[in-house]
């Protein structure tokens, strides 16, 4: 069940771990605390998930319903162009940097924002659901 890469489309699985929200075929974790981008990434990876990679405008719009004005880290970085952590380019939305240190991406209810990766922000993890919550 839900085998394969972190980034692959999940099958329709029954449930998500505690404190994770099921939406569509994925589980999402919206953090309460704040960390820098690298620490946020490590948090997600340690829980067999990844910093949020948004696949299309529809997913982005759906997720923004759950967001506030506060920015959250997502799996988006500028390495010679804005790319998601799965290696795919950002091609359904726009983000621009105002300074050379703004190389990580964040999201709030209004859209995407470039930021210095050092800024402590909330973050969003994404993973496939598990058949058995006890596995988490």
């Amino acid at each position: 069940l839900c085998q394969g890469s972190n980034y692959s489309t999940c099958a329709s699985c029954p449930s998500c771990p505690d404190r994770w929200m099921k939406y569509g075929n994925h589980c999402y974790y919206f953090s309460v605390e704040e960390k820098d981008w690298n620490s946020s990434l490590e948090f997600c990876l340690a829980r067999d998930s990844h910093l949020l990679v948004i696949t299309d405008n529809q997913e982005m719009s759906l997720l923004q319903v759950f967001l506030s004005e506060a920015f959250c880290w997502i799996g988006l970085r500028n390495n010679s162009g804005w790319r998601w952590e799965d290696g795919s380019p950002l091609n359904f939305s726009r983000i621009s940097s105002n300074s050379f240190v703004q190389t990580c991406g964040a999201i709030n209810k209004n859209g995407l924002q470039a930021s210095s990766c050092e800024v402590p922000l909330h973050w969003v993890c994404k993973k496939c659901p598990f058949a058995d919550q006890a596995l988490f």
């Epitope: 920015f71 940097s97 105002n98 300074s99 050379f100 240190v101 703004q102 964040a106 924002q113 470039a114 930021s115 210095s116 050092e118 800024v119 402590p120």
Partner: antibody, heavy 120, light 107 residues
Framework: EVQLVESGGGLVKPGGSLRLSCAAS????????MSWVRQAPGKGLEWVAT????????YYPDSVKGRFTISRDNAKNTLYLQMSSLRAEDTAVYYC?????????????WGQGTLVTVSS | DIQMTQSPSSLSASVGDRVTITCRAS??????LAWYQQKPGKAPKFLIH???TLAEGVPSRFSGSGSGTDFTLTISSLQPEDFATYYC?????????FGQGTKLEIK
């Protein structure tokens, strides 16, 4: 209310050293890049140094590189500028400045400045 | 390094006038430009970022425009408190360079 208060300016001889401080209040200091900008008497503004949130990255123009060192103490909400091998052309009012947030490196807030005079 | 050149260096105008100050970059800086106002003996005040976005609390008579290499700061109707020196600044990369300033004086 954001407040930046510089101190440590004064008269120093050429070749001497001085350390400026900037006490920050009214915001979460450890979330922002900080900078020093100076202004020689009757002249324009010149960027002097910028430091990242953690202090791990520092940036300088060629005019002060190797002579000035920017640092910060996030526990004390204080920014520093250590100046050495001072020259007459370093005479200026030195301003501490905070960025706009998220690494937006314009100078959104400024202190009142502290005067450094380099003269024999 | 990117050089910023302001014109004019000084300008005389009257209360109520519309005034435009120009800033030119030595190469394309897209919209990475800020404007500041400074009064004698005081610290600069942040006015505009990204060439046209007004900082919080800045009166709407101030506006910025331009992209690439040519930028303008416009004051639509000068008020007595607007007489000051204005600086532009490149804010994307190192070094963060300022223009030499434009002194706006009362005619």
């Amino acid at each position: 209310e954001v407040q930046l208060v510089e101190s440590g300016g004064g008269l120093v001889k050429p070749g001497g050293s001085l350390r400026l401080s900037c006490a920050a209040s009214g915001f979460t200091f450890s979330r922002y890049y900080m900078s020093w900008v100076r202004q020689a008497p009757g002249k324009g503004l010149e960027w002097v140094a910028t430091i990242s949130i953690s202090g791990g990255n520092t940036y300088y123009p060629d005019s002060v590189k190797g002579r000035f060192t920017i640092s910060r103490d996030n526990a004390k909400n204080t920014l520093y500028l250590q100046m050495s091998s001072l020259r007459a052309e370093d005479t200026a009012v030195y301003y501490c400045a905070r960025e706009g947030g998220y690494g937006n490196l314009w100078f959104a807030y400024w202190g009142q400045g502290t005067l450094v005079t380099v003269s024999s | 390094d990117i050089q910023m050149t302001q014109s004019p260096s000084s300008l005389s105008a009257s209360v109520g006038d519309r005034v435009t100050i120009t800033c030119r970059a030595s190469e394309n800086i897209y919209s990475a430009l800020a404007w500041y106002q400074q009064k004698p003996g005081k610290a600069p005040k942040f006015l505009i970022h990204n060439a046209k976005t007004l900082a919080e609390g800045v009166p709407s008579r101030f506006s910025g425009s331009g992209s690439g290499t040519d930028f303008t700061l416009t004051i639509s109707s000068l008020q007595p408190e607007d007489f000051a020196t204005y600086y532009c600044q490149y804010h994307y990369g190192i070094p963060f360079t300022f223009g030499q300033g434009t002194k706006l004086e009362i005619k």
